[in-house]
């Protein structure tokens, strides 16, 4: 069955199967280079 790949936090659709968080947090460190 189809799963919704990404919906933001103000949406009711599921993101569980998408592999992406519904509203990803900003990373707190920078990669070198």
């Amino acid at each position: 069955s189809e799963t919704t790949t990404g919906t933001s936090s103000n949406s009711s659709q599921s993101t569980s199967n998408s592999g992406l968080a519904p509203n990803p947090t900003n990373a707190t460190t920078k990669a070198a280079g």
């Epitope: 799963t3 790949t5 919906t7 933001s8 990373a27």
Partner: antibody, heavy 115, light 112 residues
């Protein structure tokens, strides 16, 4: 069957522009965030851009390396997503994949930026 | 950015033998909803990436149960209980918890 098909790649000179397209079938396109990911021997797999849903006012996000140069858009009526790339650099060379996130991927289209 | 470090770089395995790949993140991938957005992809030669596992341990449809994902926080593992010829290719981890999304450098699985 879910299918994502990219087009629009090719050879372009540094400083030039190119527009990539991706047509999606087999899923409810308007319910899915869409992303572009690129792959190069130098940098491996690198997430490039994302566009969210109409309910999110089509919010967009970009990798720092392409901010101000690339724009992403979508046409829900056609199940299409686009990546407009301006002021291209040699380091933008790679295979560009259209993906719903991590689950569905297109076959990729190759962009070569070279003089 | 969250750095995803995969080891080993290359894995040479005899068919029927087990294999294990490690992926470590520079920050915890636990999201505020209690879920951990760590995925595993396989890119077979000449093909685009295909997802095998999402949310650390959930197998995608059609993925054989010889694949197992485990881990938490910053430390994750993909295990293949018995390697088959179709398993060759490059395995990548990708995190979807923090923006920007980042990939591991890949682990090439070769068949001995």
């Amino acid at each position: 069957e879910v299918k994502l098909e990219e087009s629009g790649g090719g050879l372009v000179q540094p400083g030039g522009s190119m527009k990539l397209s991706c047509v999606v079938s087999g899923l409810t396109f308007s319910n899915h965030w869409m992303n572009w990911v690129r792959q190069s021997p130098e940098k491996g797999l690198e997430w490039v851009a994302q566009i969210q849903l109409k309910s999110d006012n089509y919010a967009t996000r970009f990798a720092e390396s392409v901010k101000g140069r690339f724009t992403i858009s979508r046409d829900d009526s056609k199940s299409d997503v686009y990546l407009q790339m301006n002021n291209l650099r040699t380091e933008d060379t790679g295979i560009y994949y259209c993906t719903t996130g991590t689950d569905y991927w297109g076959q990729g289209t190759t962009l070569t930026v070279s003089s | 950015d969250v750095v995803m470090t995969q080891t080993p770089l290359t894995l040479s395995v005899t068919i029927g033998q087990p294999a294990s790949i490690s992926c470590k993140s520079s920050q915890s991938l636990l999201y505020s909803n209690g879920k951990t957005y760590l995925n595993w992809l396989l890119q077979r030669p000449g093909q685009s990436p295909k997802r095998l596992i999402y949310l650390v341990s959930n197998l995608d449809s059609g993925v054989p149960d010889r694949f197992t994902g485990s881990g938490s926080g910053t430390d994750f593992t993909l295990k293949i209980s018995r390697v088959e010829a179709e398993d060759l290719g490059v395995y990548y981890c990708i995190q979807g918890t923090h923006f920007p999304y980042t990939f591991g450098g890949g682990t090439k699985l070769e068949i001995k």
